[in-house]
Amino acid sequence: QNSKLRGELQALRETFSNFTASTEVEVKALSSQGGNVGRKMKSLESQLEKQQKDLSEDHSDLLLHVKQFVSDLRSLSCQIAALHGNGSTLTCCPVNWLEYEGSCYWFSRSGKSWPEADKYCQLESAHLVVVNSREEQKFIQHHMGPVNTWMGLTDQSGPWKWVDGTDYETGFKNWRPEQPDDWYGHGLGGGEDCAHFTDDGRWNDDVCQRPYRWVCEAARDPAT
């Protein structure tokens, strides 16, 4: 009886062992398949993300091109209109000039004295920039770079005056602390008579002969 039970127990052990082994194999196989599926899903996800990103970039590029095309078209039609006109007013900003709030601006890259810069702007049928508001100041600052830059403000004839006749006393001002100091010690027969934007955008008065950059401004015809 004992030996019979022993035999059955042995058989059961073997059966169970075989069952465990086969189950382990199947679990491993399933696990491996699951991993493959996961990897495939991840791969598909990343492919999808890349395609989305590429599409988004293409869309942005396209938008930029469309915007540039519209801008070029507007500029071209404007230049044609200007050719038909008598040239007394700017119907659009010339090439390499920037438009802001109805005015055209040209930012120099070289340096000239204030009188030379003033003359340059006049020859371009413009004037050295006149700053009328905080917003215009920000626009100029954004485009001028970290370099001293002449503006159309001078006190060479006495009180501070804007070159286009804008009233200085009631207008926008952005002087550095303790400026203008109109320092007379330089022996030039007058004070520091010309105003410029400093590298941080705030204003300073300086000797007019300094070779600084400058900004020209011209009014655009408001009818267009």
């Epitope: 340096g111 370099v147 027969g189 300094r210 070779p211 600084y212």
Partner: antibody, heavy 120, light 107 residues
Amino acid sequence: QVQLVESGGGVVQPGRSLKLSCAASGFTFSTYGMHWVRQAPGKGLEWVAVIWYDGTNKNYADSVKGRFTISRDNSKNTLCLQMNSLRAEDTAVYYCARDQGVGYDGLDVWGQGTTVTVSS
Amino acid sequence: DIQMAQSPSSLSASVGDRVTITCRTSQGIGKYLAWFQQKPGKAPKSLLYKASSLQGGVPSKFSGSGSGTDFTLTISSLQPEDFATYYCQQYMTYPLTFGGGTKVEIK
């Protein structure tokens, strides 16, 4: 530390060309104007040319205008002086010097110099 | 161009002496003036800028003053290492111009 090292000097015949270089290190080259200054044997200092920090503005002494060209490569921290149609009076030690600012604020750091001799 | 007249062209002095060099410009240059020191066979060294501001690392025995057209460089107590040639330079406008130099020699 801030350093400027000139190279490219030598003996050259009148009418020929030479290119000087100045390697800058120890500071952010692209934010400073750069100058060339020369000194003839036994003479004083003579300013030659300036180039602004971004390369947009260049100015020259009348004595070299039309013959010399100043240039810079901010990606390589290098200043150059291309000298054409050289004359005997161009014989000098050539120094590169850093502007204190973008290009109109005077000189603060000088290189050791490179000698140019124009002779037939 | 702005002309620079430096005087004297040379001077003899003893260690411990107070030395003054002057520089006069042909037109007003504000304070846009620098001073340099040069020793034989060496590159110039910047001493002062904006007429009176000391460059970093330059001893306070060097001082500058003036504005407009008349400027001075003063060495309060001359030391052996100060025997050299000194140049003024204007940088108000291009072309930058140098004075002819002042050679400070040992008496």
